[in-house]
Interface confidence: low
């Protein structure tokens, strides 16, 4: 029988009546076009819905949009289009929602061809009121909020000007011309690239990287010969053209661009690319594309300075620049990432790491699944996860893998069980331990979401036919109940729940189609009465994360410490609640070789924890360029993994000596960098 449909599943009592009383329908007075939905603030219940409809006329396209607002998590909506003077809103800019709980919203309007500038509508009270503001420029990009101060906005114009507002879009000032890309850094700093000779495209590889720390009063050139730049964690990266040829190298700064070091990564040619897959304040995952149109590259993990890199994973699937990669941070368990590799026979396989890229392994075969036709050995195979690449290939995969930081250990994903990803219709699998073990959760493709910090999982079957049934589970996907939320089926377009998985409300979006017209409709279901009581201490159990061998003294140690969590028992049907905080108790582990990466010039042979010298560097002095000085590295081959908190135990020696020699890295050295003021 399908998972959750056997006799041992305890049923939730009287759930049909409870859900029926908490199901709210809203039919939108709209012709079907496109719909976009944004949550405004955290735990406010405020949702903005923008519907747009294009009527193609003979000479031009006439557009119409409507704006709706809910303040009860989508149970009721009010048409507030009049607050924006019935103006047509440009959907490509989306709704720019302010950071944290600022309550700020910016909508960018469509304006007629001859106008001097664009127009925005601004709200700072969670979309209760809007102020119309005419801009002195035509925006090219969505308004970007400073993460530190939501009154500070930046935008690029269609003329490549960099515009800044210090009063939430009321007044704008052009602080620089000829700008290609601009990003907020920390402390209200803006980084941007500029061109000198004509255009961003023409000057690619000859751009300058600039910084302003005072919103455009003064500037500092912090890099030349720039191809592109990126920010990740506390690292600033720039890819820089080499002097002699068309290759480029990554340079990294941890002081906002004042000083730079060349990253110990391979250089790339014109057709290749670098990509920051993930970054935090400790380290970076960097993808380096292989030469040629291979569709794969290598993942490297950095040290705590972002300079020395260790090879983490070969043949990492990443199709083209800005293309598809399956790299996924499993946010429900520290240190876990999932991605895909392209094997020699061009099949795609899923790999998982539990220690932040130190080791990668195949996903364990689910207990309740058989190996499919891709498996050579029917008794030995792995689970392979469908993610962005499968979605881009139009496989029958409606959703990418899902995990939430406050639903500890839970990962939900579409997958197939065999030697590689299959093009057959996938099933849905769940892990409750952060990816170590998996179970088939639902037959066939589904949309899914997590509510109440994992207390409820909701799913809807992916079907081309209209639907009227939703499935839900209160025991982490073991058992499922079905609820018919409407008598008249709808063409389903999406599930929406408040980001953060704390809510107990789910909105089902779709449209109804009749002979004459089609209309948007939403059904919002509140599960609060299913989880009747608040969870108590007895509802939680202690769980040791990353536990693979309870008999081992070091069991659960990942990155130098282990964590015990209080987790909801699967049998408990109760509310974690909106204020639920993950309870965890860390304890430090003693250092072993597993807590160290191989240093510059060393590598780890397969299935060995010891680092050995790279043959080509044997007997050579290890010297590299750091902050424009030649450095000599004395090492026995190990360096602590960034973020690793182990203490005691194994303690390999590592020392970096300044050789007092200058070295250049095709980059502007700090003393040559110029500053200027406006």
């Amino acid at each position: 029988s399908a998972p959750g449909e056997d006799e041992e599943c305890g049923r939730v009592r009287d759930f049909v009546a409870k859900l029926a009383n908490n199901t709210h329908q809203h039919v939108f007075d709209d012709l079907r076009g496109s719909v976009s939905l944004s949550w405004v603030g955290d735990s406010t219940g405020v949702i903005l819905v923008l519907t747009t409809f294009h009527v193609p006329l003979v000479i031009m396209t006439f557009g119409q949009s409507k704006l709706y607002r809910s303040e009860d998590y989508g149970k009721n909506f009010k048409d507030i289009t009049d607050l924006i003077n019935n103006t047509f809103i440009r959907t490509e800019f989306g709704m720019a929602i302010g950071p944290e709980n600022s309550g700020k919203v910016v909508l960018t309007a469509e304006v007629s061809g001859g106008s001097r500038g664009g127009r925005i509508f601004r709200s700072s009270d969670f979309a209760k009121n809007f102020v119309q503001t005419d801009l002195p420029f035509h925006p090219l990009t969505q308004m970007m909020y400073s993460p530190q101060n939501s009154d500070y906005l930046l935008a690029l114009s269609t003329e490549n000007g960099l515009w800044v507002s210090k009063n939430f879009g009321g007044k704008w000032e052009e602080i620089h011309k000829a700008v290609c890309l601009a990003k907020w850094g920390s402390d209200n700093t803006i980084f941007f690239t500029t061109y000198a000779n004509g255009s961003c495209k023409a000057d690619l590889g000859a751009l300058e990287l600039w910084r302003t720390s005072d919103l455009g009063k003064s500037f500092k050139t912090i890099g030349v010969k720039i191809y592109s730049f990126g920010l990740g964690g506390r690292f600033l990266f720039a890819s820089v053209m080499a002097d002699k040829d068309t290759t480029r190298r990554i340079h990294v700064s941890t002081d906002q661009g004042d000083t730079w070091s060349m990253a110990q990564l391979p250089s790339v040619g014109q057709e290749q690319f670098y990509s920051i897959l993930a970054a935090n304040d400790d380290m970076v995952f960097m993808h380096v594309d292989e030469p040629g149109d291979t569709g794969f590259g290598t993942i490297f993990t950095s040290d705590d300075r972002g300079i020395v890199y260790s090879k983490s994973l070969d043949r990492h699937l990443y199709t083209t620049t800005g293309g598809e990669t399956d790299f996924t941070n499993v946010t429900s368990l520290r240190g876990v990432y999932i991605t895909s590799v392209l094997s020699e026979d061009n099949s795609i396989q899923t790999m998982i790491t539990f220690d932040q890229g130190g080791r990668w392994t195949h996903l364990r075969k689910p207990e309740n699944s058989e190996c499919d036709a891709t498996a050579k050995n029917k008794n030995e195979c792995s689970l392979h996860i469908h993610a962005s690449y499968s979605i881009s290939q139009k496989l029958n995969v409606p959703m990418a893998p899902l995990s939430e930081p406050n639903a500890v250990g839970i990962v939900i994903a579409h997958g197939s069980v065999g030697d590689a990803i299959s093009v057959m219709v996938p099933d849905v699998y769940i892990s409750d331990d952060g990816g170590y073990s998996w179970t088939k959760m639902l037959e066939g493709p589904h949309y899914y979401t997590i509510l109440d910090s994992g207390g409820i999982i909701v799913a809807i079957e992916h079907s081309s036919r209209p639907i009227n049934v939703i499935k839900f589970s209160t025991d982490e996907g073991q058992c499922w109940q079905t609820y018919t939320f409407t008598r008249d089926p709808i063409y389903f377009t999406g599930l929406a729940s408040e980001p953060g998985a704390r809510s107990m409300n789910i909105s089902i979006w779709g449209f109804t189609e009749s002979f004459l017209t089609s209309q948007w409709v939403s059904y919002t279901i509140d599960f609060k009465d299913i989880l009747e009581r608040n969870c108590e201490e007895k509802d939680y159990t202690i769980w040791l994360a990353h536990s693979t061998d309870p008999e081992d003294y070091e069991d659960g140690c990942i990155l130098g410490y282990k964590e015990q969590f209080l987790r909801l028992r699967k049998s408990s049907v109760c509310q974690n609640g909106r204020d639920y905080v993950v309870t965890k108790q860390p304890s430090i582990c003693l250092c072993s070789l597993e807590d160290f990466l191989c240093d510059f010039g060393y590598y780890r042979p397969e299935n060995d924890s010891k680092c050995v010298e790279q043959p080509e560097l044997k007997g050579h002095d290890l010297e590299f360029c750091l902050y424009g000085r030649e450095e000599h590295l004395t090492t026995n081959g190990y360096r602590k993994i960034p973020g690793d908190k182990c203490q005691g135990g194994v303690n390999p020696v590592r020392e970096v000596k300044d050789l007092k020699k200058k070295c250049t890295s095709n980059f502007l050295s700090p003393e040559k960098q110029n500053s200027k003021s406006n």
Partner: antibody, heavy 117, light 108 residues
Framework: EVQLVESGGGLVQPGGSLRLSCAAS????????MSWVRQAPGKGLEWVAT????????YYPDILKGRFTISRDNAKNSLYGQMNSLRAEDTAVYYC??????????WGQGTLVTVSS | DIQMTQSPSSLSASVGDRVTITCRVS??????LAWYQQKPGKSPKLLVY???NLADGVPSRFSGSGSGTDYTLTISSLQPEDFATYYC??????????FGQGTKLEIK
């Protein structure tokens, strides 16, 4: 019933060596970390060494590194402590303790080591 | 190294008294702390682990509390067999897993 019985203590001259043993019974020895802790006459407790369940990892305070070696034989349910270059300040009762992680939950009765000329 | 400061170093009390012994740690140890009791000529006995959990067979008059850097062992009603020396020990980071210097509890 969990039992830990130390042996091997005695009188030894400064600079000499001694091997302590601890025989374990009443529990599955090979799934627990084990530790040595000592107590000088009239003084407090001092952690000396720890070994992981499989014997892969060993840990010592800096002051004892190089002079004390902890080892175990899981087949014999035994823990050992090899002490070299003994000094007068190593005089103490040496306890072996079961160490599952966040505490030392069972202790032996101790064996006295006296370093004196 | 993490420093442990146990106080008082000794104290006199009577049967039936409520007694509190504290252990202050030089940095946050996230409740990774144990308490032991040792009687003269005997080996130590575990009372409390993970700051608040009573070990098997320990009478309920003993309790542990605290978090961060400050931890307390409380005996709610002192019994004659409780007169002993008490030690705290942390398990957050190594080396060393330091013990407190001990608190000697004597009959008044």
């Amino acid at each position: 019933e969990v039992q830990l019985v130390e042996s091997g203590g005695g009188l030894v001259q400064p600079g000499g060596s001694l091997r302590l043993s601890c025989a374990a019974s009443g529990f599955t020895f090979n799934i627990y970390g084990m530790s040595w802790v000592r107590q000088a006459p009239g003084k407090g407790l001092e952690w000396v060494a720890t070994i992981s369940s499989g014997g892969i990892y060993t840990y010592y305070p800096d002051i004892l590194k190089g002079r004390f070696t902890i080892s175990r034989d899981n087949a014999k349910n035994s823990l050992y402590g090899q002490m070299n270059s003994l000094r007068a300040e190593d005089t103490a009762v040496y306890y072996c303790a079961r160490h599952p992680g966040g505490a030392m939950d069972y202790w032996g009765q101790g064996t006295l080591v006296t370093v004196s000329s | 190294d993490i420093q442990m400061t146990q106080s008082p170093s000794s104290l006199s009390a009577s049967v039936g008294d409520r007694v509190t012994i504290t252990c202050r740690v030089s940095e946050n140890i996230y409740s990774n702390l144990a308490w032991y009791q040792q009687k003269p000529g005997k080996s130590p006995k575990l009372l409390v682990y993970a700051a608040t959990n009573l070990a098997d067979g320990v009478p309920s008059r003993f309790s542990g509390s605290g978090s961060g850097t400050d931890y307390t062992l409380t005996i709610s009603s002192l019994q004659p067999e409780d007169f002993a020396t008490y030690y705290c020990q942390h398990f957050w980071g190594t080396p060393p897993w330091t013990f407190g210097q001990g608190t000697k509890l004597e009959i008044k």
